[in-house]
Interface confidence: low
Amino acid sequence: QNCSGPCRCPDEPAPRCPAGVSLVLDGCGCCRVCAKQLGELCTERDPCDPHKGLFCHFGSPANRKIGVCTAKDGAPCIFGGTVYRSGESFQSSCKYQCTCLDGAVGCMPLCSMDVRLPSPDCPFPRRVKLPGKCCEEWVCDEPKDQTVVGPALAAYRLEDTFGPDPTMIRANCLVQTTEWSACSKTCGMGISTRVTNDNASCRLEKQSRLCMVRPCEADLEENIKKGKKCIRTPKISKPIKFELSGCTSMKTYRAKFCGVCTDGRCCTPHRTTTLPVEFKCPDGEVMKKNMMFIKTCACHYNCPGDNDIFESLYYRKMYGDMA
């Protein structure tokens, strides 16, 4: 974690790193380790790949224990086999408008990304690709039982997933903020990022937050009651403390996590918020990190398709975030 004691390295030879990953000395100049890659968590002991122009971005100097591997200012992006300059905007497909910033790509959906929840008169909503149209549209499969359960006051229940218009004009600045990317881990602590120019200088900057979609140890499928198809938003039974590279959150949290869907649908965060979490490290230092907290999850058929480069990389975005 830090550089205050003698080296404790595994015996040489050095570890074997995956193809394209550099073998470097850790930040203490002590042990040989496989370099962390773009967007991964990094520490003094787990440095980023210098041969790819990455550095560990820690945010404010007071929070210098754990950072995110970030490309140096002006680094280009490689996206779908094409190189884009830092600051360049491009349309990755008819569905997404993207911006390259210092090696990272942030994209905004051009299609509505709402989640349509089942309702009595539309129990099996599906998104389908219609001929000649870019954006998928919702269709309702006919229910097997035509009997309507309860009064159909509305055709369907549609959760409004967007807050205010993400494009705003403020003091000669066209404010644009991409959606938060999907959490980099499907379980355990990961990273979610976005690109925004919502700052005093109207300059594009990358923001990151910690995220945990679900704990890795939770066996959620076993908890699904017979006849049910998913646990959408299980609340953890007891308050927990988050752990991050040996540091522990100072407060306990009764957090919500996303469950599982046994019917082949994806279960991902639907509404989230971002809150600061303080972590205390073994050497007594305290660091503050922004973290995603889940408000609701959704089971849906809108799973990533391998033929869509954007969706396969960023398979599901976080919407309705309040910060």
């Epitope: 830090n2 550089c3 205050s4 004691g5 003698p6 080296c7 404790r8 390295c9 015996d11 040489e12 050095a14 470097v24 000395l25 930040g27 203490c28 100049g29 002590c30 040989r32 003094e44 210098p50 550095f55 560990c56 971005h57 820690f58 100097p61 210098r64 950072g67």
Partner: antibody, heavy 115, light 105 residues
Framework: QVQLQQWGAGLLKPSETLSLTCALY????????WSWIRQPPGKGLEWIGE???????NYNPSLKSRVTVSVDTSKNQFSLKLRSMTAADTAVYYC?????????WGQGTTVTVSS | YVLTQPPSVSVSPGQTVSITCSGD??????ASWYQQRPGQSPILVIY???KRPSGIPERFSGSNSGNTATLTISGTQAMDEADYYC?????????FGAGTKVTVL
């Protein structure tokens, strides 16, 4: 108390190879990096390179082509070889034990390169 | 990677003196400080930005944020007259500042 004792030839001709050795007394040899640092007359410090117990090395890119740092764990010693010496290599050469920072330093060896 | 220090600073006995060390995003790295008296080997006085090795007096303290690390000597004594070097790691290489000569008037 950790002690580092260093020795080696102090006067060299241009193109010759510098050989210095540093021995550790009263300390553990296995858990640290063992470094060489030099200081030209009236100037600042320059890190040369280092070795760990397994022989893993790390060198200053500006000197890498000329430097070899090696270790002899059986004797608790490590050595520096710097090839193709020139007048610009005239300096006091220090050995040091390092973990993150250079915690303990040898007494220094004055090396002069002159024809 | 370059670490920049002022060549010299002066201080009266008992006063406080601060030495700065500047480098690109230095606050994202750990800074160390070394004291070197004339004709002697350097001594580590601060490591990991703020920490003092055993045997180093409490009057030595360090900080590091943004692009600048600072070594502060409070209640300076005549024996503190020496050259002081900052040091940090970048891309697997150790870098030293050019040194600051502290003169106790």
């Amino acid at each position: 108390q950790v002690q580092l004792q260093q020795w080696g030839a102090g006067l060299l001709k241009p193109s010759e190879t510098l050989s210095l050795t540093c021995a550790l007394y009263d300390g553990s040899f296995s858990d640290y990096y063992w470094s060489w640092i030099r200081q030209p007359p009236g100037k600042g410090l320059e890190w040369i390179g280092e070795v760990n117990r397994s022989g893993g090395t790390n060198y200053n890119p500006s000197l890498k082509s000329r430097v070899t740092v090696s270790v002899d764990t059986s004797k608790n010693q490590f050595s520096l070889k710097l090839r193709s010496m020139t007048a610009a290599d005239t300096a006091v050469y220090y050995c040091a034990r390092r973990y993150g920072s250079f915690e303990y330093w040898g007494q220094g060896t004055t090396v002069t390169v002159s024809s | 990677y370059v670490l920049t220090q002022p060549p010299s600073v002066s201080v009266s006995p008992g006063q406080t003196v601060s030495i700065t060390c500047s480098g690109d995003k230095l606050g994202n790295k750990y800074a160390s400080w070394y004291q070197q008296r004339p004709g002697q080997s350097p001594i580590l006085v601060i490591y990991q930005d703020t920490k003092r090795p055993s045997g180093i007096p409490e009057r030595f303290s360090g900080s590091n944020s943004g692009n600048t690390a600072t070594l502060t000597i409070s209640g300076t004594q005549a024996m503190d007259e020496a050259d002081y070097y900052c040091q940090a790691w970048d891309s697997n290489t150790a870098f030293f500042g050019a040194g600051t000569k502290v003169t106790v008037l």
